[in-house]
């Protein structure tokens, strides 16, 4: 039975250039993360982070992603075209898939203001 | 299996800088995120910073910005920490350490570094 | 930054009883917390992540617990090869912390 839950940042927003945390965090359950998987709005994959294998991050990425903190990731350089869903995939043992949604959006303004308050989907 | 192994201690003069290493074997190394520690006798730790070998992207405790400078080389599997204008404070056992999923799962024997005139 | 208390400073026991190590955040960190145990000149060891995950080849009398601020590491039956000091460590931002460790010693 899955009891766990996954907060993430909700929506957020960054300015043009700047970088972003985009995390997730899974709570309520002792199922042990054996991945964790990175996708955007059109489910292209930014990156997976496997517990054995380390980090894979996809060409597309491969100079704007920086690991962590945590098990969330930082994208740097960020573009208007960097606006959109963004989906966090825990593959967990015993319980199987957990799915948390982040919206980004970039804003040109310089008074764009980075929030990362926790919430539940 | 999982190795780091550390270069051997340093003394070194006030002033002066050093660099030491950290080899890993037995994982894809420019995969995994490495990590420095401080740790100075009988004390505590301290997060000195993190890199990422396969972009080199690195992040750094604020405290250590001007201290620390954290290189990798992916083709002989080597993380690299140099510390600079070094004082007495700077004398510490040094540790490497590969993060999985966000845990630091190995860590390095250390690197002792004395600061001395 | 995050600050992490650790209690006692030191806790004297014998080998046979059992302990609890508490570890306080300054602020919210959910379960983004580990234990690390280090013996003298040793390298520290990964105990427990994420506040109560256990690790493979660790003692099953190592357990933790807690989430937010407050967490606690326990060790049921402690044995001689336990004695050495235990930092926890948070991972929820940047810059990741230590907290300065509680010494547990043979009485």
């Known amino acids: 039975m899955m009891t766990g839950t996954i907060e993430t940042t909700g929506n957020i927003s960054a300015k043009k250039g700047g970088s972003v945390i985009l995390q997730c965090h899974l709570s309520s359950t002792m199922a042990q993360v054996t991945q964790v998987n990175w996708e955007q709005h059109d489910h292209s994959l930014l990156a997976i982070r496997n517990a054995e294998l380390g980090w894979h991050i996809y060409p597309a990425f491969k100079d704007r992603v920086a690991p962590g903190p945590g098990l969330g990731l930082t994208l740097q350089s960020l573009t208007m075209n960097d606006t959109g869903e963004y989906f966090c995939t825990y593959h967990t043992y015993p319980d199987g898939t957990y799915r948390g949604r982040i919206f980004l959006e970039v804003l040109e303004s310089s008074v764009a203001e980075h929030s990362a308050r926790f919430q539940i989907p | 299996q999982v190795q780091l192994q550390q270069s051997g201690p340093e003394l070194v003069k006030p002033g002066s800088s050093v660099k030491m290493s950290c080899k890993a074997s037995g994982f894809p190394f420019a995969n995994h995120v490495m990590h420095w520690v401080k740790q100075q006798p009988g004390q505590g730790l301290e997060w000195i910073g993190c890199?990422?070998?396969?972009?080199?992207?690195?992040n750094y405790n604020e405290k250590f910005k001007v201290k620390a400078t954290l290189t990798s080389d992916k083709s002989s599997s080597t993380a690299y920490m140099e510390l600079s204008s070094l004082a007495s404070e700077d004398s510490a056992v040094y540790y490497c350490?590969?993060?999985?999923?966000?845990?630091?799962?190995?860590w390095g024997q250390g690197t002792l570094v004395t600061v001395s005139a | 930054d995050i600050v992490l208390t650790q209690s006692p400073a030191t806790l004297s026991v014998t080998p046979g009883d059992s302990v609890s190590l508490s570890c306080r955040a300054s602020q919210n960190i959910r379960s983004n917390l580990h234990w690390y145990q280090q013996k003298s000149h040793e390298s520290p060891r990964l105990l427990i992540k994420?506040?109560?995950q256990s690790i493979s080849g660790i003692p099953s009398r190592f357990s933790g617990s807690g989430s937010g601020t407050d967490f606690t590491l326990s060790i049921n039956s402690v044995e001689t090869e336990d004695f050495g000091m235990y930092f926890c460590?948070?991972?929820?931002?940047?810059?990741?912390?230590f907290g300065s460790g509680t010494k547990l010693e043979i009485k």
């Open positions: 890199i990422f070998p396969f972009n080199e992207i690195t």
């Open positions: 460590q948070h991972i929820n931002n940047w810059p990741f912390t």
């Open positions: 350490a590969r993060e999985q999923l966000g845990s630091f799962a190995y």
């Open positions: 994420y506040a109560s």
